[in-house]
């Protein structure tokens, strides 16, 4: 196994919908046709998986159909994006990145993506 | 040896669709992607896409998306290309070809299946 | 996608002769992650498959003879046959192999006095 530099914003602020985009960068050592993408939560020193993707490149990112993340590729960036937050899903989003064809096999882990999410405020009630 | 067995020529109406094979020997099937590639008559080589024979996921050149179909056999270790409707322009040789274990570049190709489309 | 451009299209010449022909593409194959150039040179005989001579724009793929060479970085790209033979009468592709989607260029049609 290769390493490899993968870069990411360090915080995000997810919007009042609950949805948190950033861009997840590797620098690619070499040719890559297939690339697996993989969003982790930690929180608490406990890694979760969020999300995983593999894509042969000229392809869309596909994650599963009850997936909360989507995203898009061009070249050797990964726009990654994040649905249904709360408050409670703040945390450090990491993106780990491997390349899995043609050989070497290469794995990139970035920094993380601190998201901070606010739950928005109830609406009062209007008196009409 | 590697080897790349593809299947033999067709003679097909417009509007109809073909299934070719590409029987592979000599290698692990599922280590190596399967590439397809069009040569019509007197013409250069178009690329038409891709497959992973472990996994199935296949990548496609914009223009034959939704005119070629790759799959696989991992049981026959078979690679098959699926063209529909088939015009005057799909009249053309079509190879198979391995990546190269080395350089994994297009290193070993089938003998071509010639398709002809005529009415 | 990657366009790729040879020339010429098809030349003319004795056994023995020293034959290059030129090839280029629309934006560098040169990966700065390697610093390898992505480009592969085809032979195809007529009624033949293509068959592979040169990978990363200058390694010769086994077997084949040294009397062909190919150079060139980045956009630019040449092959050439030392001292070309009778049975090295085919037609020259070059290929983006940079990824997808891999394009050829037109050729160039080697012919024999």
């Known amino acids: 196994c290769k390493a490899m530099h993968v870069a990411q914003p360090a915080v995000v602020l997810a919007s009042s919908r609950g949805i948190a985009s950033f861009v997840c960068e590797y620098a690619s050592p070499g040719k890559a046709t297939e690339v697996r993408v993989t969003v982790l939560r930690q929180a608490d020193s406990q890694v979760t998986e969020v999300c995983a993707a593999t894509y042969m490149m000229g392809n869309e990112l596909t994650f599963l159909d009850d997936s909360i993340c989507t995203g898009t590729s061009s070249g050797n960036q990964v726009n990654l994006t994040i649905q249904g937050l709360r408050a409670m899903d703040t945390g450090l989003y990491i993106c780990k990145v491997e390349l899995m064809y043609p050989p070497p096999y290469y794995l990139g882990i970035g920094n993380g993506t601190q998201i901070y999410v606010i739950d928005p405020e109830p609406c009062p009630d209007s008196d009409f | 040896e590697v080897q790349l067995q593809q299947s033999g020529p067709v003679l097909v109406k417009p509007g109809a669709s073909v299934k070719m094979s590409c029987k592979a020997s000599?290698?692990?099937?599922?280590?190596?992607?399967m590439n397809w590639v069009k040569q019509s008559h007197g013409k250069s080589l178009e690329w038409i896409g891709a497959?992973?024979?472990?996994?199935?996921?296949?990548s496609y050149n914009q223009k034959f998306k939704g005119k070629a179909t790759l799959t696989v056999d991992k049981s026959s270790s078979t690679a098959y290309m699926e063209l529909n409707s088939l015009t005057s322009e799909d009249s053309a040789v079509y190879y198979c070809?391995?990546?190269?274990?080395?350089?994994?570049?297009?290193?070993?190709w089938g003998q071509g299946t010639s398709v002809t489309v005529s009415s | 996608d990657i366009v790729m451009s040879q020339s010429p299209s098809s030349l003319t010449v004795s056994a023995g002769d020293k034959v290059t022909m030129s090839c280029k593409s629309s934006?560098?194959?040169?990966?700065?992650?390697?610093?390898?150039?992505?480009l592969a040179w085809y032979q195809q005989k007529p009624w033949q498959p293509p068959k592979l001579l040169i990978y990363?724009?200058?390694t010769r793929e086994s077997g084949v003879p040294d009397r062909f060479t190919g150079s060139g970085s980045g956009t630019d790209f040449t092959l050439t046959i030392s001292s070309v033979q009778a049975e090295d009468l085919a037609v020259y592709y070059c290929?983006?192999?940079?990824?997808?989607?891999?394009?050829f260029g037109g050729g160039t049609k080697l012919e024999i006095k």
């Open positions: 934006q560098s194959l040169l990966h700065s992650g390697n610093q390898k150039n992505y």
């Open positions: 070809a391995r990546d190269g274990s080395i350089h994994y570049v297009m290193d070993d």
């Open positions: 497959i992973n024979p472990d996994h199935g996921g296949s």
């Open positions: 000599g290698y692990t099937f599922t280590d190596y992607y």
């Open positions: 990363g724009a200058s």
């Open positions: 290929q983006n192999d940079y990824g997808y989607p891999y394009t």
